[in-house]
Interface confidence: medium
């Protein structure tokens, strides 16, 4: 197969946006499958176009509707003949147009009167490309060859810059870059105490406007009253805009405020936010839990728990928890130190514990009281006789010894 490109010079230059038709003449084959290749890659061309000139002479067309810069390159056509690929002479297609920006000036944020640079680069073809700089509507530099760097000694207000690229085909204007002045950040807002315990507080806030300079840190200041002595000041890197305040005194009134800083300095403080740490949960377990058999069921009694200090606050109701081997279980809340237990099965062992609660939660459980089923069956004493089945289980009221009794495996026993 003798292949040659027909009617096209070796170098073809077209203007951007113009249509291009490359043709390729194939002689010496009856049914060539003409494929076009650009820079080594086969060009997909769904409208395969073959024009028979004669039985062994064909013309293939590659049609580009609108030439773009990306169409520029080295083209050739190829056909397969007896397992061999025949390749035509190449055509170098150049697409000329107004300059194309490869680097445009970027938006910046700078401190007042600080020097900065802006960059601009554009390419042809055709070359050469020259650059002119504009500040607002005033031409301030150039023409200079591309690429170009504009050095600015400083600005005192937000200012617009752009560059213009020129070649023989015309001119192109870059994007407009805005150079903003950096400032101190605005005060944070939505300062919230998100989680409170007796000694810790979690704080979160939303940052105010950053003044176009990266926020570097925020300071959380804590006092025991607004304007009082500073108890704590924590500097946290940001983001995230959160802070954990540790080692606070339980049941105490505090106030906090937050400010954030960028490279230029700190923001104003946000408003004071008051909060109160929680008191302590009761420290003691009720003592001397015992049972009294009555006609109507079982009465449980225990000794009153006295607060160990003001941080525990007022002690509220008692919580009674009981469980049986058959899986029956329940919890009661009672105001006093006495509870009437109903709904249990006297034929099964019964395990009972009690704790005292306050606003924070329940204190430690008492030692468990085990009421055996045979004790119920065998008890012959008169009604209201006081029989105590206090059976210590383990050495600590705070510990759950799962191995002693299957009842301890119930999740309701976990505090």
């Amino acid at each position: 197969a003798g292949l040659k490109l027909m009617g096209a010079p070796v170098k073809l230059t077209v203007s951007q946006g113009q249509p291009v038709k490359l043709n390729c003449s194939v002689e010496g084959m009856e049914e060539p499958d003409i494929q076009w290749v650009k820079d080594g890659a086969v060009v997909q061309n769904l409208d395969q176009l073959y024009i028979p000139v004669s039985e062994q002479h064909w013309i293939g067309f590659l049609s580009l509707k609108s030439a773009e810069r990306s169409d520029a390159g080295r083209y050739w056509c190829q056909v397969e003949d007896g397992g061999e690929t025949e390749i035509s002479q190449p055509v170098w297609l150049t697409v000329e147009g107004v300059p194309f920006f490869t680097v445009e000036p970027k938006d910046l944020a700078v401190p007042p009167n600080a020097p900065f640079q802006l960059s601009c680069e554009a390419v042809g073809p055709p070359e050469p490309v020259t650059i002119v700089w504009w500040r607002g509507t005033t031409k301030i530099g150039g023409p200079a060859p591309s690429p170009s760097v504009l050095n600015v000694t400083g600005v005192t207000q937000s200012t617009m810059f752009s560059c213009e690229a020129h070649n023989l085909k015309g001119l192109a204007s870059s994007r407009t870059a805005t150079v903003h002045l950096q400032a101190l950040p605005a005060a944070p807002f939505n300062v919230t105490v998100t989680k409170l315990s007796s000694s810790n507080a979690s704080v979160a806030w939303m940052p105010g406007a950053d003044g176009r300079a990266l926020l570097q840190s925020c300071t959380v200041q804590v006092t025991q009253a607004p304007g009082g002595w500073e108890v704590l000041a924590v500097v946290v890197p940001v983001p995230p805009f959160t802070c954990l305040l540790r080692d606070l005194v339980p049941a105490t009134n505090y106030s906090l405020r937050v400010r954030c800083a960028n490279a230029l300095g700190p923001s104003p403080y946000a408003d004071w936010v008051p909060f109160q740490t929680k008191g302590l949960a009761p420290a003691s377990a009720p003592q001397n839990l015992h049972a009294i058999r009555t006609d109507s069921g079982l009465i449980l009694e225990w000794e009153e728990v006295i607060p160990e200090g003001p941080l525990e606050g007022p002690l509220g109701p008692y919580k009674l928890s009981w469980v049986q081997d058959n899986g029956t279980q329940d919890e009661l809340t009672v105001e006093g130190t006495r509870a009437n237990l109903t709904g249990w099965d006297p034929q099964k062992d019964l395990i009972v514990r009690v704790c005292v609660s306050n606003a924070v939660g329940c204190g430690p459980w008492s030692q468990p009281l085990v009421v055996s089923s045979h004790d119920h069956a065998g008890q012959q004493g008169p009604p209201h006789s006081r029989t105590s089945w206090l059976v210590p289980r383990g050495s600590s009221a705070h510990h759950h010894h799962h191995h002693h009794h299957s009842a301890w495996s119930h999740p309701q026993f976990e505090k």
């Epitope: 038709k21 499958d33 769904l46 409208d47 176009l49 509707k65």
Partner: antibody, heavy 125, light 108 residues
Framework: EVQLVQSGADVKKPGASLTISCQAS????????ISWVRQKPGKGLEWMGQ????????NYGPSFQGHVTISADRSTATAYLQWRSLEASDTAMYYC??????????????????WGPGTLVTVSS | SYELTQPPSVSVSPGQTARITCSGD??????AYWYQQKSGQAPVLVIY???KRASGIPERFSGSSSGTMATLTISGAQVEDEADYYC???????????FGGGTKLTVL
């Protein structure tokens, strides 16, 4: 005179295989690509894919890639559209289409098209 | 996947000019083709390569393309022009072709 003769209407059950055909006459079959176009009842045209018979090169639309196979038999000047497993959503009219370029004077072609009459495929259980 | 967008319907009175648009991101780079399909018939090519009228098509049919929009214009629409019209083009890299959703032209 250029003619594209398509195979007759067909009714199939879901999961069945099917091949429909388009036989060309009145021109050199290998000169021009043939494409297949689907039209569901009351809906628009959808380009499925094409084949260049002289090289058996194919292109498929993204929705049809892997679901249908386009092939050609140069000896009988016939193009084929094949399904291995039909679905109810394949119910449609299928057209084969062939472009035709004619030079008048120089080498700039004038563009014509020929459409087959269509093959109605119904997939129903 | 690439899409060509057409208005679902266009209505004109006989003798008026009908314009049907087709928009697609690759149309600055790829040619648009227009087809006419009358009820129960196979489609017929009306315009190829944006603006060239296919053989046997009346002169009142013309095509144009600018940027991402191609337009089929029927100057002095006739009752017999009532049909569905489809635009057709390729995706930007030429890997596959697509039809627009079709526009129903009503000539009242």
């Amino acid at each position: 005179e250029v003619q594209l003769v398509q195979s007759g209407a067909d009714v199939k059950k879901p999961g069945a295989s099917l091949t429909i055909s388009c036989q060309a006459s009145g021109y050199t079959f290998t000169d021009y690509w043939i494409s297949w176009v689907r039209q569901k009842p009351g809906k628009g045209l959808e380009w499925m894919g094409q084949i260049v018979p002289r090289a058996s090169r194919t292109n498929y639309g993204p929705s049809f890639q892997g679901h249908v196979t386009i092939s050609a038999d140069r000896s009988t000047a016939t193009a084929y559209l094949q399904w291995r497993s039909l679905e109810a959503s394949d119910t449609a009219m299928y057209y084969c289409v062939r472009p035709y370029f004619q030079t008048s004077g120089g080498t700039i072609p004038e563009y014509y098209q020929h459409w087959g009459p269509g093959t109605l495929v119904t997939v129903s259980s | 996947s690439y899409e060509l967008t057409q208005p679902p319907s266009v209505s004109v009175s006989p003798g008026q000019t009908a314009r049907i648009t087709c928009s697609g991101d690759a149309l600055p780079k790829k040619y648009a083709y227009w087809y006419q399909q009358k009820s129960g018939q196979a489609p017929v090519l009306v315009i190829y390569e944006d603006e060239k009228r296919a053989s046997g098509i009346p002169e009142r049919f013309s095509g144009s393309s600018s940027g991402t929009m191609a337009t089929l214009t029927i100057s002095g629409a006739q009752v017999e022009d009532e049909a569905d019209y489809y635009c057709y083009s390729q995706e930007r890299n030429g890997n596959y072709a697509v039809f627009g959703g079709g526009t129903k032209l009503t000539v009242l």
